[in-house]
């Protein structure tokens, strides 16, 4: 969370701003926040890059201008209008590319004066493990299977019985690169498993972390995803 | 010294539509949005919808979806809020407002009363 | 959709004495609260928006404050014209929701 203020004569405006994460091919959003104001046609949003010249963005009497654009953004980017009334400043970007991550500016100028904060965008992949009881293999085993991460994550094995347990002996894990020849495809096998237990599969970069879990007894199994952000504000 | 007009009391049957407006005069008509709040007798204040002409967007409680449609004339600095399918729990005091996100400036109000 | 809550419902003060009215949102509404005030008879009147900010010709006397989802508009010392009812109302989110209000009257 980053709070950034502006100074235009005697007057300031608060802008926010959040960390965040964009994932790769999908559409992201910066987030940034600010006073409102009720004269709506004075409001001029401003989304500036680091190292770039021209714009990210620029929103203002009601619209979009984008006349200063940097190419790089070219159609992939709009502003929540309705959401500028509620003082949201948040940028919409679609198709994230690796590129798109650096430190932006959100600047603010309102009738009540101005303001600006930076927010840091990270970009990589991520993506939900789902896991599986793995019946071809020659003793009962686990594969958690996750389509898309980038940078290469680190992947680790738990287990609600044996806690604290190391499993990186019995467990086997590869990265096979995608197609765009950018994210991997995360695949890892846990071997020797036992029933009525929960296992779990956690898969980790510096951007996001995700769980898998799953639950085999003899009548059934039970399966959990859950995917976080890491450093988001 | 921003003034906003209201059109007169009206009595309605129930089933018809109203049909309320607002004159503006004092400030940019289009650099504002324009809410409708109502008032039942004896009751607090209900935001209805409003309308930002500098955005051309409109958005309406959900409470009235289908029921409300507000429109501006930038050219007569002029709103308008029709309400169809009128029944008696419609009875309210009218109010137009400079606004959102929150309200400066308020009509006198128009008295709507649905009767049969 | 952000439920707002007031109280009291009515809060009997006398004139000099300060009053203390509150506003409760079901969500954080950060600073995107505004409050009203309304005699019978006429029109809502804008007294205070962005939490603590007093609009174009409201008294001193008249404070907000809060944040998140707690808010309170103090009034320091009550004069007759201070009488009426008054409404809190978010615009973090559409759509914009006021309080049920709380009547302020004279003991």
């Known amino acids: 969370l980053i709070i950034g203020f502006g100074i235009s004569g005697k007057h300031f405006i608060t802008v926010t701003t959040f960390t965040s994460a964009g994932n790769i091919g999908e559409d992201g959003t910066l987030s940034c926040t600010f006073e409102p104001d009720i004269k709506l046609n004075g409001i001029v949003i401003q989304w500036l890059k680091e190292g770039i010249k021209g714009l990210v963005h620029e929103f203002k009497e009601g619209k979009d201008d984008l006349s200063q654009q940097h190419e790089m953004f070219r159609g992939r980017t709009a502003v929540f209008a309705d959401q500028v009334v509620v003082g949201n400043a948040s940028l919409r970007l679609k198709n994230v590319q690796l590129t798109d991550a650096g430190t932006y500016t959100c600047y603010i100028r309102t009738s009540k004066g101005k303001g600006n904060a930076n927010l840091e965008y990270k970009t990589g992949a991520f993506s939900m493990p789902e896991i599986n009881v793995d019946y071809n293999a020659s003793s009962e085993s686990l594969r958690c299977e996750a389509p898309r991460w980038f940078p290469q994550p680190t992947v680790a094995w738990a287990s609600q019985v044996d806690q604290g347990a190391n499993f990186s002996e019995v467990s086997n894990t590869s990265f096979e690169l995608n197609s765009e020849n950018v994210t991997m495809k995360v695949v890892s096998v846990l071997y020797n498993v036992t029933i009525n237990n929960t296992y779990s599969c956690m898969i980790e970069n510096d951007i996001a972390k995700a769980t898998g879990d799953i639950k085999v007894t003899d009548s059934e199994v039970k399966r959990r995803s859950q995917l976080q952000l890491l450093n988001s504000g | 010294q921003v003034q906003l007009v209201q059109s007169g009391a009206e009595v309605k049957k129930p089933g018809s539509s109203m049909k309320v407006s607002c004159k503006a005069s004092g400030d940019t008509f289009s650099s504002y949005a324009i809410s409708w709040v109502r008032q039942a007798p004896g009751q607090g204040l209900e935001w209805m919808a409003g309308i930002i002409p500098v955005f051309g967007t409109a958005h309406n409680a959900q409470k009235f979806q289908g029921r409300v449609t507000i429109t501006a004339d930038k050219s007569t600095s002029t709103a308008y809020m029709e309400l169809s399918s009128l029944r008696s729990e419609d009875t309210a005091v009218y109010y137009c407002t400079r606004g959102g996100p929150y309200f400066d400036y308020w009509g006198q109000g128009t008295l709507v009363t649905v009767s049969s | 959709e952000i439920v707002m809550t007031q109280s009291p419902a009515t809060l009997s003060v006398s004139p000099g004495e300060r009053a203390a009215l509150s506003c409760r949102a079901s969500q954080s509404v950060s600073s995107n609260l505004a409050w009203y005030q309304q005699k019978p008879g006429q029109a809502p009147r804008l007294l205070i928006y962005g939490v603590s900010t007093r609009a174009t010709g409201i008294p001193d006397r008249f404070n907000g404050s809060g944040s998140g989802t707690e808010f309170t508009l103090t009034i320091s010392s009550l004069q007759s014209e201070d009488f009426g009812a008054y409404y809190c109302?978010?615009?973090?989110?559409?759509?914009?929701?006021f309080g049920p209000g709380t009547k302020l009257e004279i003991k």
């Open positions: 109302q978010q615009y973090k989110k559409w759509p914009f929701i």
